[in-house]
């Protein structure tokens, strides 16, 4: 049993190293953002015993604009800034400190995501993210994914093709 792809967290990325049950991964806030105190970037692949389906736990992570970086790199409206990360310690459950996360390899500017309509030609239109996008992790790999997304999409005849499949969202650890 393995987990589906991870859900998205606004202004954060994740690169999953293992989709195995009980594996733990960490989201990292994009550049220009920092982890809000008291929130956790950790997610774990766990089993829902009732359904026997694995899913990623929802991290409590909130990435907020880093005031220290605002004067250096102001983000234009309706873009999402991304790139290096200011590592921040965060507490683990019951005791101890989480190690500071390593910087992902992202850079800055407009975040767009790909719409998921099997067999369609789709072009994402850039618009500001307004919240965490979470996608159901209990779909079949070939069904139409159910996705709640705060992004606007327009169909065009000449855009990129989205292959059918499940499209949940999710840092990157450079190797």
């Amino acid at each position: 049993i393995t987990c589906p792809p991870p859900m998205s967290v606004e202004h954060a990325d994740i690169w999953v190293k293992s989709y195995s049950l009980y594996s733990r991964e960490r989201y990292i806030c994009n550049s220009g953002f920092k982890r809000k105190a008291g929130t956790s970037s950790l997610t774990e692949c766990v089993l829902n015993k009732a359904t026997n389906v694995a899913h990623w736990t929802t991290p409590s992570l909130k990435c907020i604009r880093d005031p220290a970086l605002v004067h250096q790199r102001p983000a234009p409206p309706s873009t999402v800034t991304t790139a290096g990360v200011t590592p921040q310690p965060e507490s683990l459950s019951p005791s101890g400190k989480e190690p500071a996360a390593s910087s992902p390899s992202s850079n800055n500017t407009a975040a767009t995501t790909a719409a998921i309509v099997p067999g369609s030609q789709l072009m994402p239109s850039k618009s500001p993210s307004t919240g965490t996008t979470e996608i159901s992790s209990h779909e079949s790999s070939h069904g139409t994914p159910s996705q709640t997304t705060a992004k606007n999409w327009e169909l065009t005849a000449s855009a990129s093709h989205q292959p059918p499949g499940v499209y949940p969202q999710g840092h990157s650890d450079t190797t």
Partner: nanobody
Framework: EVQLVESGGGLVQAGGSLRLSCAAS????????IGWFRQAPGKEREGVAC????????HYVDSVKGRFTISSDSADNTVYLQMNSLKPEDTAVYYC?????????????????WGQGTQVTVSS
């Protein structure tokens, strides 16, 4: 028109090698993250490897580390996935995907463009 086209898939014996190519047209890879994903029958799609062209950083899922290598050739706007020591469990349709001006992520919906996929079958 933006297109990503994968090639290089095929049937190979366990222990063999393949090199997948992802060729882009309609845009350049200057500041893109290009990810390779795979989907085996009845399984979820998973991120296999990713490269950020602006800084050359690479990322791999644990199950392919040391066996697969992702690389990019900006001259011909192509990203490659060299797959060595292939195992039957690597059998899947392999897709490449591009994400504009942002880093690598395993979040599928974060990618702007996707290719149609290429079948890789590893026989035992």
């Amino acid at each position: 028109e933006v297109q990503l086209v994968e090639s290089g898939g095929g049937l190979v014996q366990a222990g063999g090698s393949l090199r997948l190519s992802c060729a882009a047209s309609g845009f350049t890879f200057d500041d893109y993250a290009i990810g390779w994903f795979r989907q085996a029958p009845g399984k979820e799609r998973e991120g296999v490897a990713c490269i950020r062209n602006s800084d050359g950083s690479t990322h791999y899922v644990d199950s392919v580390k040391g066996r697969f290598t992702i690389s990019s050739d900006s001259a011909d706007n192509t990203v490659y996935l060299q797959m060595n020591s292939l195992k039957p469990e690597d059998t899947a349709v392999y897709y490449c995907a591009a994400r504009v001006r942002l880093g690598c992520t395993s979040v599928l919906a974060a990618y702007d463009y996707w290719g149609q996929g290429t079948q890789v079958t590893v026989s035992s």
